[in-house]
């Protein structure tokens, strides 16, 4: 199976493009919108009927080094009485993001783009019921 | 920059931090090779805080196409299938990194960009403000 490639010879190259060695791409890791802040509603992870916890994964050879992952606290959902209702399901909501991986081969260093699946939070869903004949 | 461990046997010229500009292999490694079969794509309909998905396309971005969530209701769907306004549907937002062609239209020159996307919605108890 082919691994997707970023960039391509398919593109007409404008004159202003920087020269890039074959098989690689130039990546500026000075992030655009670096200081943008998430304006998510306050502590929704605790107020949700499908609450979740956060875990920070840290990897010094990854950029960004910190990636936050959510885990649903319950299998069921929290009802109006604050009790777990197992007739409903808490399920993870996921989103793909890109990271840069730094690889050491002997004394040389190379960089690789990676797609990483991040669990962002949880939502409460009605279960799919499979009827057995 | 990000400090990384240095192989003690290597020359000291190696920078401990990520440099500002790097040359990256064109092949993207996929950490999520086995898409979780339990990961359903119909949660947007089955959720008590259902959402619609909107297509956003930008050829100068990698990925070019991103599907964004918008909550269908202000309230949440109760057991009877009606909207309950005592609860709130709110978007779950995430900052993700994408690549932006820089300069524009260049095939193999990018800059990282942080964008905020709404991934889905969740049902929350509202914050009640009591007026004195």
């Amino acid at each position: 199976r082919k691994i997707p490639k970023v960039g391509h010879t398919f593109f007409q190259k404008p004159e202003s493009c920087p020269p890039v060695p074959g098989g690689s791409m130039k990546l500026d890791i000075g992030i655009i919108n670096e200081n943008q802040r998430v304006s998510m509603s306050r502590n929704i992870e605790s107020r949700s009927t499908s609450p979740w916890n956060y875990t920070v994964t840290w990897d010094p050879n990854r950029y960004p080094s910190e990636v936050v992952q959510a885990q649903c606290r319950n299998l069921g959902c929290i009802n109006a009485q604050g009790k777990e209702d197992i007739s409903m399901n808490s399920v993870p909501i996921q989103q793909e993001t890109l990271v840069v991986r730094r690889k050491h081969q002997g004394c040389s260093v190379s960089f690789q783009l990676e797609k990483v699946l991040v669990t962002v939070g949880c939502t409460c869903v009605t279960p799919v019921i499979h009827h057995v004949q | 920059g990000i400090t990384i461990p240095r192989n003690p046997g290597c020359p000291n010229s190696e920078d401990k931090n990520f440099p500002r500009t790097v040359m990256v292999n064109l092949n993207i490694h996929n950490r999520n090779t086995n898409t979780n079969p339990k990961r359903s794509s119909d949660y947007y309909n089955r959720s008590t805080s259902p959402w619609n998905l909107h297509r956003n396309e930008d050829p100068e971005r990698y990925p070019s196409v991103i599907w964004e969530a918008k909550c269908r209701h202000l309230g949440c769907i109760n057991a009877d299938g009606n909207v309950d306004y005592h609860m709130n549907s709110v978007p779950i937002q995430q900052e993700i990194l994408v690549l932006r062609r820089e300069p524009p239209h260049c095939p193999n020159s990018f800059r990282l960009e942080k964008i905020l996307v709404s991934v889905g919605c969740t049902c929350v108890t509202p914050i009640v403000h009591h007026v004195a």
Partner: antibody
């Protein structure tokens, strides 16, 4: 190699519904959207809409709202299009085609072989 | 919706002859794709984002244009180029196709 295998020809009665399928192989199914195209007997091509197997998102040409429902099943790597309340106007060849979400300049790069739908009483 | 008008609707050319067909959009668009279709087969991606040839497309084909006016050119017509060529825009929903230009060999 990349393949989009579409279901066989359909001969259906007016007023009924039909579901066409498009089974994908040879690539990572969730990296691509599936678009559906109608080709009329006059050889006119019309874009029906798109489904994203990853998120479940769909977008329709307003002309086909209420006519076509697009879905995809990740586990079987199959996209479906249901056509409802069929009339003779719906007699056509229907194609599924893939569209790379990561770099859109590829366009619709692989097409299924097409499914012929004939609506006749 | 954006209407794409292709002209001519039908044309014929001798082998070796230069062939140009046009696609006019009712509103300005950023990119144009072209698809080739032969009788009894599915359309094939031919040129995308105005001028980028799909893999396997002979270099005698070229695409150009901007705004509302786009064209596809065959520098030196060959027998295998006889087909119908459709332009397609994806700058605005719904995506639309032109009515096609049928190219025949003399």
């Amino acid at each position: 190699q990349v393949q989009l295998q579409q279901s066989g020809a359909e001969l259906v009665r007016p007023g009924t519904s039909v579901t066409l399928s498009c089974k994908a192989s040879g690539y990572r199914f969730t990296d691509y959207e599936i678009h559906w195209i109608k080709q009329t007997p006059a050889q006119v091509l019309e874009w029906i809409g798109v489904t994203d197997p990853e998120s479940g998102g769909t977008l329709h040409n307003p002309k086909f709202d209420g006519k076509a429902t697009l879905t995809a099943d990740k586990s079987s790597r199959t996209a479906y299009m249901e056509l409802r309340s069929l009339t003779s106007e719906d007699s056509a060849v229907y194609y599924c085609t893939r569209y790379y979400k990561y770099e859109s300049f590829y366009g619709m790069d692989y097409w299924g072989q097409g499914t012929s739908v004939t609506v006749s009483s | 919706q954006i209407v794409l008008t292709q002209s001519p609707a039908i044309m014929s050319a001798f082998p070796g002859e230069k062939v140009t067909m046009t696609c006019s959009a009712s509103s300005s668009i950023s990119y144009m794709c072209w698809y080739q279709q032969k009788p009894g087969t599915s359309p094939k991606r031919w040129i995308c984002d105005t001028s980028k040839l799909a893999s396997g497309v002979p270099v005698r084909f070229s695409g150009s244009g901007s705004g509302t006016s786009y064209s596809l050119t065959i520098n030196s017509m060959e027998t295998e180029d006889a087909a119908t060529y459709y332009c397609q825009q994806r700058s605005s929903y719904p995506w639309t196709f032109g009515g096609g230009t049928k190219v025949e060999i003399k």
